[in-house]
Interface confidence: medium
């Protein structure tokens, strides 16, 4: 549970975080697991501990092994293990599986590829990005902060992407590379004018005075990821938040994706302790997106409670 695999290339910087998390103020001691020898904290050492981080500047193949970190809180010593493997640099272009970070998927609308582990390093923009060992060029590729954005993603954009950056430690620079696969989802999404599934137009909903009532506004907006879509309730043409009746609140339901792949949204209107005056209000279910707005109106009517004596 508290063991973590880390890997890197020889002559590159590698920084590993202790798998046992503690508060920033907690003392963290690092040891070579085999010898139980303490790892120094002095930065003049090639391998040194810095709080929750273990730094190899740069890494050597001989550094491979298991490292123990002990997070010392006031009372409790919590132990974690970092299983570190340093590999020799490959002469050819292929990046072996054991050097790959988790695969990410993208689509036409969402094509961010984050540079793995970069948050552990002291780096400055820009990042360099490579695909299958070729430097990425052209206006479709944008290196932004710690991720790469690909415009108008196509199936051919799938492949192995490597980010390269420089880690700076006390004025000394060290190279770091990290590679992950990118797959492209064939997502033929579209957007259409909102379709309200519930409530029906001019529906009359029966409610009991003094009881709670729920009204659900449900609408679908197209297929795939929707850029802008919303469902909401209005009371007499006013937003719920502006209406000022604390008994009546709206609450987002779950995003739904039906079996036919449509992207739908729910919004539940909760009326606590239904009162006579609630029957006089006009309840509007609104669904809107870039195509426009659709409105279905509901009114409440009194439901006569069952007479248990008759």
């Amino acid at each position: 549970k508290f063991s973590k695999q880390s890997w890197g290339l020889e002559n590159e910087a590698l920084i590993v975080r202790c798998p046992r998390q503690g508060k920033p103020s907690y003392t963290v001691d690092w040891y070579y697991s085999q010898t139980n020898k303490s790892i120094p904290t002095q930065e003049r050492n090639r391998v040194f501990a810095s709080g929750q981080l273990l730094k190899f500047l740069p890494a050597a193949v001989a550094d491979s092994g298991i490292y123990t970190c002990i997070v010392r809180s006031p009372t409790f010593n919590r132990t974690g293990y970092a299983n570190v493997t340093i590999y020799k640099k490959q002469s050819d272009c292929n990046v072996p599986d054991y050097l790959m970070y988790s695969t990410v998927s993208g689509s036409e609308k969402n094509s961010k590829i984050y540079c793995p582990t970069i948050d552990l390093y002291n780096w400055t923009a820009p990042l360099e990005w490579f695909k299958n060992c070729q430097a990425l060029q052209g206006s479709r590729y944008r290196a932004h902060k710690s991720f790469l954005v690909i415009d108008n993603v196509m199936t051919e954009d799938a492949g192995d992407y490597t980010c390269k950056f420089i880690h700076n430690e006390n004025g000394a620079n060290y190279s770091v590379t990290a590679t992950r696969s990118f797959t492209v989802k064939d997502e033929q999404g579209f957007s259409l004018f909102p379709v309200i599934g519930a409530p029906a137009q001019n529906e009359i909903k029966e409610v009991e005075i003094g009881k709670n009532a729920n009204l659900t506004c449900s609408a679908c907006f197209g297929k795939g990821t929707q850029f802008l879509a919303a469902v909401l309730w209005q009371l007499n043409g006013t937003k719920i938040t502006d209406f000022g009746e604390p008994r009546i609140q709206q609450e987002e339901g779950q995003n739904q994706s039906f079996s036919n792949g449509l992207a739908c949204l729910d919004m539940v209107l909760r009326i606590a302790d239904v009162k006579e005056e609630d029957l006089l209000l006009q309840y509007d279910c609104l669904a809107l997106n870039l195509h426009g707005l659709r409105r279905h109106t509901v009114r409440l009517s009194r439901k006569n409670p069952i007479d248990h004596h008759s």
């Epitope: 508060k23 907690y26 003392t27 001691d29 303490s38 010392r72 809180s73 006031p74 009372t75 409790f76």
Partner: antibody
């Protein structure tokens, strides 16, 4: 300013149980581990145990295992110590104390005096 | 358990002069990370203990710099450079190297 407010003095019969409380204010409750300390003229200061409100972890001095049970309620920022099967040996002043990594026993409550007598 | 040993009373001191209080541990309090887990507390009459020194030589916040502490892994000394009336009380050393945490029996600072 970190403050630990302990419950008032207790006079209880032998064999009974008692729960002492320690309400924290002026800081984030989960930022401090809560230690409990017993003080008597004979044995001086003795560490009973500790409770980590963030994780729920407890640690006890072997001497007080089975005697003391430490808990906490995050919602009210209050730590509790239950003492069971009380005898006259348990008569003492009990302190709660908040600890951070460097500052062990950094902040102390005012103490709760417990007298066990028939 | 680690035993912390203190003498019950200090030599009576005159206000404005310096005082020393000693403490000995039954094992070294030096951790492999280089920190010595020795703490000093003062309990003034009718009050709760208060932290003075942490990790052998560091002054806790709000503690006057008249207080200082030094020592090896097992022998420690708390020094008060110019004793004031408000310094009277019982001084405890404690170890936080290993469980159970243990305190010394306390040294009472007496004024001439």
């Amino acid at each position: 300013q970190v403050q630990l407010q302990q419950s008032g003095a207790e006079l209880v019969r032998p064999g009974a149980s008692v729960t002492l409380s320690c309400k924290a204010s002026g800081h984030i409750f989960t930022d401090y581990e809560m230690q409990w300390v017993k003080q008597t003229p004979v044995h001086g200061l003795e560490w009973i145990g500790a409770f980590d409100p963030e994780t729920g972890d407890t640690a006890y001095n072997q001497k007080f295992k089975g005697k003391a049970t430490l808990t906490a309620d995050k919602s009210s920022s209050t730590a509790y110590m239950e003492l069971s099967s009380l005898t006259s040996e348990d008569s003492a002043v009990y302190y709660c104390s908040g600890s951070t990594t460097d500052y062990y026993f950094a902040y102390w409550g005012q103490g709760t005096s417990l007298t066990v007598s028939s | 358990d680690v035993v912390m040993t203190q003498t019950a009373f200090s030599n009576p001191v005159t206000l404005g002069t310096s005082a020393s209080i000693s403490c000995r541990s039954s094992k070294s309090l030096l951790h492999s990370n280089g920190i010595i887990y020795l703490y000093w507390y003062l309990q003034k009459p009718g009050q709760s203990p208060q932290l003075l020194i942490y990790q052998m030589s560091n002054l806790a916040s709000g503690v006057p710099d008249r207080f200082s502490s030094s020592g090896s892994g097992t022998d420690f000394t708390l020094r008060i450079s110019r004793v004031e009336a408000e310094d009277v009380g019982v001084y405890y050393c404690a170890q936080n190297l290993e469980l159970p945490f243990t305190f010394g029996s306390g040294t009472k600072l007496e004024i001439k």
